[in-house]
Each structure stands twice: as C-alpha cells, then as structure tokens.
C-alpha cells in the first residue's frame, strides 16, 4: 500500500527538487500539532503565534487573552500554569534541562485579579517541580529534594519534608531510574481531586552504586557527574508512599501507606499512584522480578488518620509468559462508582485488551476482544468509554480512536476516526475536555498532520486548530520518497515492515538498502505516521531504500511477538532483521552488496549483533549509543526482559548476548561507533567497551564521540553526527559525494 | 489609571445610524477584550456584545446581531459600536466595558454615552 | 436565555446593618467547579462598578465587607456592615453563557 505518493509527473520535474540534508537538518519541513490546554467542559488555553496565552470559550467561539506577551517577556517566561480558581499564572523561566523529563525553573506568581506579580514569600529559586492544587490555588513544590506546601501563593511556605539531600533522598521528585524507566515523569506527588490531600513518594538511594562520568565544559579540570544508577542485579532504590492532609498539614504530619504483603516480601517497586476520590487512592507495586504487579485501593480513615488498604481491595496481575504489561503496567481508569475501573491487560488470547473490574480481577468482564490490540484508555464518562486501538483494517502500526458507549446495553462500539480523513489520517491520539464535553483530534499521518476539535455528544468537527498549510505548500515542489507498509509471513511470524522508496523508483533497477533498526521490547517502528527526516533524504537525494521492520519483541500485535524475547534479548530482534533482509534481497530491487543497518540506543545493541551475525549480507553499519552489555544497563528496564544477572537466574544469556562477545565478527563489515561522553542513560562504559573488545581482537573499525553530549546527542552535534553518519553510508554505497 | 470614554451618543431619527467611540487609556487594548452593554432609562442592564481585539473578533447578543456592529482600531486605543436601523426602544446610556476574559468579569467601565431616537 | 432574578427588588436599611441580597438564575451557571456570577454596584448617574466577581472574590479596591456565596442557581451578595457610601442599586449578572444577563436590580436605601 503506497502511502505517500509521489507528486512527480514528467512535465512537473523541473521544478521539483529532492530533499537535502540541509532541508533535515534545518527542520525544514517539520509539522505543528495543536493540543488544547483544557481547562473546562468547553474552554482552553492556547499561546499565540505572538505569545500570548490566550483562551478560547469554544461554545461563544470568542478568544480572550489572559496573559499577554509583554508580561510573559517581562520574566522571560517560555512555560506558564493557570490555578483552578482562575486568580493566579505562574510563569516559568530559566529552564535548566536535567534528565529525560527532569528540568529546573524559576518561578513567579502573577496575580490575574490585579495584574501585578506577588510580591512576598517568592518562591526560592531554583525549583524542581511546582503545581498548583486541582481546586483553588494552593501550590505544592520540590526545592532541594524537599516538598514544600502554600495555601496562597503569597503566604508562607509549609515544609512537608526536611531529610531530602542529593542524589540520597528524593522527596515528590525521582530519582534517575525511577523517571527514566517508572514513572515516566519529572514529578512524584499527587494531589487528590480537590486538594484535599497530597500524596508524595520518597526514593532512597543512600545504598545505589553511583555512575560517574566526567564533563569536560570549558574549566581546567573536568567535572565529574554522579548519579546514582542501579544497574542490572545492583542495589535498587527504596520507595516509601505518604499522603498529608494539606488544609492541615502540621496536625498529624505525612502518613505512609502500606505496602502490600506479598509485595513486601522481596524487592518491589511502586508503579504509579491514582486518586478515586478525596478518601481513596489507588497505588500500584510491583515486584523486582516484573512478572507480579499489585493494584491496591486505600481508603483514608477518619477515626486514626492513617490510610487503610484492605486486602480484599488488592488486585494482582500476573503474567506466566513474560512481564506484567506491556512497556510499563496499565493504570486503572476508575468509574463514577468510584472503586470498580477499566484496565488494559493480556486476555486469555494474549492480546491486550480493555476489561472492567468490579470485584475481582478473575471475574473481569472484557469490554474489548480481538487478534488486535487496545492501546490507551482517553477518558470514561458517565455514559462513553473513549479508547485507541490498532484494530482498523488490521494495521498494527496505525491508531484510531473508539467510542464504547457504556451508558446502555449491550455496549456499542463506534469508530470515531476510521473514516475522517482516511487517506491523509491513520494515527490518531486525543485530548479530551472535562467530561469529554469537547475533544481534540491529532492526526499524525500518514499525510500531513492535521489538529481538529470535536462536539463530544455528536462526535462532529467544529473546526480545524491546525492543518499545517505552510508545511504543505512547502512541500509542493519537493520530490519525497514513497512509503509502503506491508508485511512478510515468515515461519507463523508475521513481520511488519515499512520501505521507503526513492521518489523514481523501478523495480527492474537495483538500490542499496539501508535497515533502521529500534528493536527494543514494546517498541514499534512501523508506523502510519508522516515524517520528512534523515531517512527521506537519503531515499530522495541519494537513491536508497530504506526499511524498517518490527521483529519478535515488538508491540501491539499480541504476547506472542511481545514476550517472545523474554529473558534472552539480542537472539530474534537480529534474527528478524536478518530475515527480512533476505526477504528484501528476494524482491529483486536490491543491490545485495550495498546494504546497510544502522540504529540508536537499542537500535545500536541490535544493529550492532547484526553486524556482527557473521551472515555476510551487511557491508556497513552504524551503531549510536549502543547498549554492549546488558549488565550496564538499568536494573528497572533491564530486569523486566532479562531477569537477574545471576548464576541461579539468567547470568549466562547476560553474557552471551554481548557486543563485546562477537568482537570477531566485525572483521568483514565497516562499523562506525558513536556516542556521547555524557550519556547519563546508556553510559558512555558501553561504546568504550566495544572500542576496547575491538581493539584487542585487532578489528579496524571508524568511531566517533561527542563531548559532553547526552543520549540525545543534540543542538550542533545533531548536525555532524547526521553528517558524518551521511558520509559514511556514501562512501560505504560508493556515491559520490 | 484605566480608562474608557465614550463619545457619539445624541439624538437620532428612528430608522437612523449612529456610531459610538469609546477611547482606552492606561492600558493596551489589545490585552483585554471589550463589551458595550445598554442601560434604558430607569431600566436594568443589556448586554450588547463583546470584540476580541487581536482579530477583531466578535461575539453579540442575538437580540442586536445584524444591526449593531463593534470594531476597534488598535492603533487609536478605541473600541466603536455602529448602531444602523435604530428604533425608539434603543434608547440608552450606553456604556464600554473592560472584559477581562479569565474571570468574565467586566471590570472597568466608561462613564456612558447616552442615545435617544426620537422623531 | 439565562434568567436572572433579584430579590428583593429594594430594601431599607441602616448603616451597620447586615444585608444580604439574593440572585436566582433560570438555569444552573455551573462551570466545572466555577460559577461566572458577577455583582456591581451602581450609584445614580454613574457606570456600575464591579465588586464581586466569579461568585466570591472581591473586585480591586472593593472593601471586605462585601462577599458573595453561592453555587448552581442561588447566589448571595452580603454587605456585613453597612457603610453611608454603600447605599445604591446593585445588579447580579452572570457570564456563564451568551448573551450575558443581569439582574433587575436591588436599590439599598436608607432606613
């Protein structure tokens, strides 16, 4: 199936050009989406091209700005937040980028009433995380790994927690393996509904071994970073669970919450924290060995101020083929009886789908079924149970939203997006308002993404927020590559790919080919999405396939794919790779003596051992950031997939699925390695211990390293690592230059 | 100090036109929208309609839709109201209002103009 | 349209007094936890001044002896003590859907 075709007729080839690495580089051709700040049944906020924060009352369709640029520049303000009660802004600036989600700011206050900054009590600077309470205008924020608590933004503060000290105790914020590869979050507190309460986490690291690497920046001497670091088998992080009542935080002080027996029992982890109501909370725990997962319900208790989580409120999900979830385990959405809620889990066919849950997990009523799977829960109303799945026409690597209307039965399911705009849009999310009054759709491809905004009872278009018009018009004289989504049925494994093709293509002619490869567990490459980025340059402008294919390991289309790769990592994402290669090769088109594989972070690790598969099909290949030795990386992320690097558990696979191990092998291939010498996720350790494997067994190889630079390998690198990569793969292809 | 003038008021035939003025100052226009609301002799409160002044965009009551206009020019700091096919029953003090939209909450106002039509 | 009604329609009362004024609206004005409910004060021969806005908080330079409740439908003005400047008409108004409507009006006057 052709999703882009090609604009290109004989008598428009003049005035098309290809697209330039210049083009990628300069972002170009990048798209804009619109995702209202809701902050109503049928109002949202919005900055404006010239920066004011403006809202839009969607049912009197008139705007007005809250906050204008001058004010936001008078701060230099690039974030902002309202409060519930619509009296105060904070404005947020100097950000200071941390980790992944982490960053730290200074804020001010802006008072809407009198349009003059809060002056008194400002906050101290500079702050980890800050939000206001979901009703009214309290402020709960983290300074120095402690959380501190305002009823007004001009009183004084409230010190909840006083042991918070780097990289030892972290108070309402996580702790590195905690944001990276838990929560997902640059927070770890919880207000409850209406603020009544506010829950928090406290990681201990005091016993973590710390991951130290220098940062050379401009000074005689480097510096050095520590951060503590649990890798695969090390000493992980404690977590402790408290909630104080916030209108009266000095009465009985933080309450932790009890952590489930069978849970406390060994190692565990905390997952994720859902508030039912003012007095319920929902707390999800996990075991070391991720197969475990406890969902528990607390109930607050007036009579002793403690939270009580009963045992008959605990639900666990357990998994006998691999790990609990899928990249991370669901979150409940509690319905308005406010202790029964839905959930995405494996059925008994080992898709996951939608079940509701009254009682008890073994009495789950499936709200959703098929060889497909249901991938996020938007929103749950009195009446309507709003969804994403894959199921349409049975793409694994498109989404599209649903409606389950729950308010009567039997429950009807309609499509909302299938048929749209179904040419230009197969990938969709959502934003819902309050009580999905209104929604926002974004489309993100696989034509040009489109925004819209929808009537929540009729589901009818009202208007388009963004339609990227300049994007389009942009593109009308650039020749852009053709993308297929197809599949190979390879020995009962269906291998999803999607190829790229230059914009002239002809079969009866051969192209080198280029395999990008991600490859990790619960991933997926291929996608109904538009994107105009290194990988269309080098089909446009320089003439080469490119695929991408998800292999055994990957998400969506069920557990059998998924945890095919539980506990032996490395073995059948390559295989797959490999096979679909060949598969490649067996089309035709291919020039088999020009091929190519090249990924970042796992993508690396699986380019990597594919290279080093000694099959002979690979003339090059880069790898960005590689993981080499999975004892070197997160003990979370990790452990999920490969169990304990010990020799009662799963030692040897650690071993055996090393870069370093297949050294040899690279003998016949070019190998270009790169990596950031700042990369606090995959350490810099990991490509070092390649070049070192590399240089003992006296294989050449290229390699290339970024000073001071993270995983993401941005700003001024981006641009010589896409370079440098494009040199290589011409001169690897024989291009000329 | 805000402020808002009105100018333009006075004595119109029925069936006549008549365009308002009201002058801001003390603040940017273009940071707050802006009402004008009707008040008939001994009478309540009548909302007219309400200008966003980035774009000019409007929103009236139905009652006045097609007959009463409102626009502003930025440049000037002034918001108008041009009222066409007017009748007696449009007799007012008519008043411009600083709509701060957060809080729907008209906050400052003008010291009226009034209009009478009558032949 | 949203209906609003004011009761009651005039009263006397004396400096220090409490007074309370009530607003009915035809429909809730209800917004996700908010009500747009707005109250002005109104002197004859001058524009209404805002005093309260969004149900309860007070306007700039408004004194704190006025203070406005209510949720859905009913909603309260109250003056605790009664000042000399505070006899005048005061109006509800809400905000919560177009076309915006106000109240017919309370007239404090002097006992």
């Known amino acids: 199936i052709v999703l882009r075709p090609s604009r290109v007729h004989n008598s428009e080839e003049n005035t098309m050009r290809a697209l330039t690495l210049k083009d990628i580089l300069n972002g170009t051709f990048s798209y804009k989406t619109f995702f209202p700040n809701w902050i109503s049944g049928q109002e949202y906020l919005h900055q404006s091209a010239d920066n004011n924060i403006v809202l839009y009352n969607i049912e009197t369709g008139q705007s007005y700005t809250i906050l204008s640029n001058r004010t936001m520049k008078s701060v230099n303000a690039s974030n902002y937040g309202l409060s519930p009660d619509r009296q105060f802004v904070y404005l947020e600036s100097d950000y200071s980028k941390l980790w992944r989600y982490s960053y730290t700011a200074t804020y001010y206050i802006y008072d809407l009433s009198n349009g003059e900054f809060v002056r008194g009590n400002e906050l101290p600077r500079p702050i980890q995380y800050l939000c206001w309470s979901p009703v009214g205008s309290k402020l709960a924020y983290v300074y120095q790994n402690n959380i501190y608590l305002k009823q007004r933004p001009g009183d004084p503060p409230f010190q909840i927690t006083f042991n918070g000290r780097e990289n030892k105790i972290f108070n309402g914020i996580p702790d590195w393996v905690y944001e990276e590869e838990m929560l997902a979050t640059k927070y770890a507190l919880w207000w409850s509904p209406n603020g009544k309460f506010l829950a928090y986490a406290e990681f201990n690291d005091t016993d973590i071994p710390v991951i130290a690497y220098s940062y050379y920046g401009d000074e005689q001497y480097p510096r050095t970073i520590n951060i503590p670091y649990p890798k695969a088998g090390a000493k992980n992080p404690v977590v402790r669970i408290f909630i104080i009542d916030t209108t009266y935080p000095a009465y009985v002080g933080p309450q932790e919450v009890p952590v489930p027996a069978m849970i406390a029992s060994s190692d565990y982890y905390f997952s994720w924290l859902t508030w039912v109501t003012d007095e319920r909370v929902c707390l999800q725990w996990l075991k070391r060995v991720q197969n475990v997962s406890v969902l528990s319900i607390c109930d607050f208790r007036e009579d002793w101020q403690t939270w009580d989580c009963p045992k008959t409120q605990e639900h666990i999900e357990e998994s006998r083929t691999g790990w609990a979830g899928g990249f991370f385990v669901s979150t409940p959405v509690f319905s308005y009886d406010a202790i029964s809620y839905y959930k995405i889990f494996s059925d008994k066919d080992g898709y996951k789908h939608i079940h509701y849950i009254k009682d008890t997990v073994e009495n789950a009523i499936q709200i959703t079924s098929g060889k497909w799977e249901a991938i996020n829960i938007f929103r749950v109303t009195q009446d309507s149970l709003f969804y994403s799945s894959n199921e349409f026409e049975e793409y694994p690597g498109r989404r599209n939203i649903y409606r389950i209307s729950i308010g009567s039965y039997p429950p009807s399911k309609k499509c909302v997006t299938c048929h749209l705009r179904k040419e230009r849009c197969q990938y969709y999310t959502a934003s819902f308002s309050d009580y999905a009054k209104y929604y926002a759709l974004v489309c993100y491809g696989p034509g040009i993404p489109i925004s819209t905004l929808h009537d929540g009872r009729t589901d009818q278009e009202i208007k388009i927020l963004e339609e990227n018009k300049e994007l389009e018009n942009a593109l009308k004289n650039i020749q852009l590559p053709k993308e297929e989504i197809k599949k190979l049925e390879v020995d009962e494994i269906t291998l999803w790919y999607k190829m790229i093709l230059p914009p002239q293509f002809d079969r009866s002619k051969k192209y080198p080919l280029l395999i990008q490869v991600y490859g990790g567990p619960c991933s997926q490459s291929v996608r109904s999405v538009f994107a105009v980025n290194w990988i269309s340059y080098l089909a446009s402008k320089e003439g080469m396939v490119i695929a991408l294919v998800d292999g055994r390991g990957t998400a969506f289309q069920g557990d059998k794919l998924l945890y095919a790769v539980y506990r032996k990592l490395g073995v059948y994402e390559v295989e797959d790779q490999i096979t679909a290669v060949r598969k490649f090769i067996e089309m035709g088109f291919i020039d088999e003596k020009r091929i190519a594989i090249w990924g970042w972070s796992y993508g690396g690790y699986v380019s990597s051992l594919a290279l080093a598969s000694g099959t002979g099909l690979f003339k090059c290949g880069i790898a960005v950031a590689p993981v080499s030795s999975w004892e070197y990386y997160a003990s979370v992320y990790t452990e999920r997939f490969m169990g304990l690097p010990t020799k009662d558990d799963n030692l040897e696979h650690y071993k055996n699925s090393t870069v370093m191990a297949r050294a040899e092998y690279f003998r016949n291939v070019d190998y270009l390695l790169i990596h950031g010498t700042a990369d606090d996720n995959v350490h810099f350790q990991n490509s070092a211990q390649i070049a070192k494997a590399l240089v003992n067994a006296q294989v050449d190889f290229q390699a290339m390293w970024y000073s001071d630079q993270n995983h993401g390998l941005s700003g001024l690198s981006t641009n010589h690592l896409y370079t440098h990569m494009t040199h290589f793969l011409k001169q690897c292809f024989s291009l000329s230059d | 100090e805000v402020q808002l003038l009105e100018s333009g008021g006075g004595l119109v035939q029925p069936g006549g036109s008549l365009r308002l003025s009201c002058a801001a100052s003390?603040?940017?226009?273009?940071?707050?929208?802006m009402d004008w609301v009707r008040q008939a002799p001994g009478k309540g409160l009548e909302w007219v309609g309400d200008?966003?002044?980035?774009?000019?965009?409007?929103i009236y009551n139905q009652k006045f839709k097609g007959r009463f206009t409102i626009s502003r020019d930025n440049s000037k700091n002034t918001l108008y109201l041009q009222m066409n096919s007017l009748r007696a029953e449009d007799t007012a003090v008519y008043y411009c209002?600083?709509?701060?939209?957060?809080?729907?909450?008209?906050?400052?106002w003008g010291q009226g103009t009034t209009v009478t039509v009558s032949s | 349209d949203i209906q609003m009604t004011q009761s009651p329609s005039s009263l006397s009362a004396s400096v220090g007094d409490r007074v309370t004024i009530t607003c009915r609206a035809s429909e809730s004005v209800d917004n996700y936890g908010l009500s747009f409910i707005n109250w002005f004060q109104q002197k004859p021969g001058k524009a209404p001044k805002l005093l309260i806005y969004?149900?309860?908080n007070r306007g700039s330079g408004v004194p704190s002896r006025f203070s406005g409740s209510g949720s859905g439908t009913d909603f309260t003005l109250t003056i605790s003590s009664l000042q000399p400047e505070d006899f005048a008409t005061y109006f509800c108004q809400q905000s919560n859907e177009v076309p915006y409507t106000f109240g017919g009006g309370t007239k404090v006057e002097i006992k």
């Open positions: 003390g603040y940017t226009l273009t940071d707050y929208n």
């Open positions: 969004g149900t309860s």
């Open positions: 209002t600083r709509f701060r939209g957060i809080h729907y909450a008209m906050d400052y």
């Open positions: 200008i966003y002044p980035n774009t000019g965009g409007t």
